[in-house]
Amino acid sequence: ECVTQLLKDTCFEGGDITTVFTPSAKYCQVVCTYHPRCLLFTFTAESPSEDPTRWFTCVLKDSVTETLPRVNRTAAISGYSFKQCSHQISACNKDIYVDLDMKGINYNSSVAKSAQECQERCTDDVHCHFFTYATRQFPSLEHRNICLLKHTQTGTPTRITKLDKVVSGFSLKSCALSNLACIRDIFPNTVFADSNIDSVMAPDAFVCGRICTHHPGCLFFTFFSQEWPKESQRNLCLLKTSESGLPSTRIKKSKALSGFSLQSCRHSIPVFCHSSFYHDTDFLGEELDIVAAKSHEACQKLCTNAVRCQFFTYTPAQASCNEGKGKCYLKLSSNGSPTKILHGRGGISGYTLRLCKMDNECTTKIKPRIVGGTASVRGEWPWQVTLHTTSPTQRHLCGGSIIGNQWILTAAHCFYGVESPKILRVYSGILNQSEIKEDTSFFGVQEIIIHDQYKMAESGYDIALLKLETTVNYTDSQRPICLPSKGDRNVIYTDCWVTGWGYRKLRDKIQNTLQKAKIPLVTNEECQKRYRGHKITHKMICAGYREGGKDACKGDSGGPLSCKHNEVWHLVGITSWGEGCAQRERPGVYTNVVEYVDWILEKTQAV
């Protein structure tokens, strides 16, 4: 339990870091949470008693004691950042603000049929932070139905004013709804020669790329490694932008690396969580505490447990000194990054893990898997669930995947003849079906959501969501898998596995131990040749060996086709149908999950 409620008619006194404009106190709280130092805030709502120039101001505050004196003030709303909370946090804001004009640089103006179309345009425009749309009731005729795309240095409006018959809102890039390409490559020996909007210190190009991703103006970056010839620029991370949204010039330079903001793929890769340790590296910054600690891991935990700590440096103990404990220096800075990075002094440095909760849980690294063999080991596929029916007797019905703490993604065809969700049980963290006894805990199903265009597996739309009655507490043996990014449509996945308790051959029985098989993806053209009597649509994806031998089969339906890309597992397919099992030149056909991301988000994020 953390302080999430807002304090009405209350102002926090002092501790000001900066002032931004937000359309609501709720969004002010989100901005505070994502700011590197903000712990509390005061927002001023519109009120006749308040000077209109102060309406919608969001004052971000910090305090050594995590609290500030409270003063009564009409129209002021105060609260705390979510940094102090351990729940998952999202910057996604789908709210539409009526009769508010959010000011910024109006860089694009076009006609749109609706506010929703204007918001989609903003979401799919690389520069857009927010928009204002003049409705068809807007007094000025030539401005009606005009969609203004806007951006600012901070990503928040420079001012907000009341204006009748307009609506405003934010880009939905942080809701994973952008169709922009997701370019994950880091280009070695490359400098992007475009204008710098900011610069920070970073230990490697990956951290630099993550910082670029959550910086509102950064579209791409250049990082100078510690071997860069100019000493003053070593470990410098340059955050960049351009009018076109792409680098205008690429210069070949040794010891520099460049890459792109991961904004369009941020829901499926970590961008806030810098979990690596940097050996023989010292991070400089303002000191918060110096503590004796057993190891650099223990030092990272201390940093994580101190809400104001952003990064740390651990100096290992000299032999037989201080009971083998080294010194742990907890540090912070104005922007969350070290003010300087030094090498060759023996320190081990890293960052707080407190910000990991701002990333999707699905990006957490899981246990290394055992390659080879067909039986899985515990914790190898923590998103895999077994869906049981209790009618007429209890048995395994289908597989499924955890995609959220109350959501299972599975196949629609699993529910043929299932009259009610009451007869369903979802078991997670299971390796062997024999573990399931009368008293084994399970999740009841509150609702079955079948795609309304589903008719039969072979004609597509074979996708369904199960809303659980209670939430899943994530552990090493039960945690979600990431959905693929829409910007990842062109990714070629080479490490894909199908898992399930299904038959090993066409006439068989459900397996006791969860089985796994590595299976290559097949192009839709190739797949279509193998299934002349069916239409293989772009909403399907196929996988299989030409010679057969490995495939999903009866009982695997609804389970995942999981593909590893850039160290993160993605739910690329849902086991759907095929002709026989593991037959030569008959690949398995799976629901192509990337084509249903919008549908999934619409259903799971519905209020």
Partner: nanobody
Framework: QVQLQESGGGSVQAGGSLRLSCAAS????????WSWVRQAPGKGLEWVSA????????SYADSVKGRVTISRDNAKNTLYLQMHSLKTEDTAVYYC?????????????WGQGTQVTVSS
Amino acid sequence: QVQLQESGGGSVQAGGSLRLSCAASGLRFSIYDWSWVRQAPGKGLEWVSAINSGGGVTSYADSVKGRVTISRDNAKNTLYLQMHSLKTEDTAVYYCATGDGGSWYRDGDWGQGTQVTVSS
């Protein structure tokens, strides 16, 4: 050198009360979140309660809600756990630890623990 010293444990009848203390030294007590964690005989560790560094935010496990109160005194570098309406299932070794018990805050520095025994 971080040192955590729990005290205040003992034997008590069901329904009774105890106040546990944890004195911390070797670190700036006030900047950390703190938790109480317990281990019953033959069981794993169970998070009991947490308090944030400012002291304004507290949280409790369902098993103890309404029966325990966590507090801190930053001036004395001390963490407290007031327990009342004790049940036999509260029998355990109680430890204080840095962190709020969230999944990414496991393992900080631990004290030796203080034994609480509740008999019927």
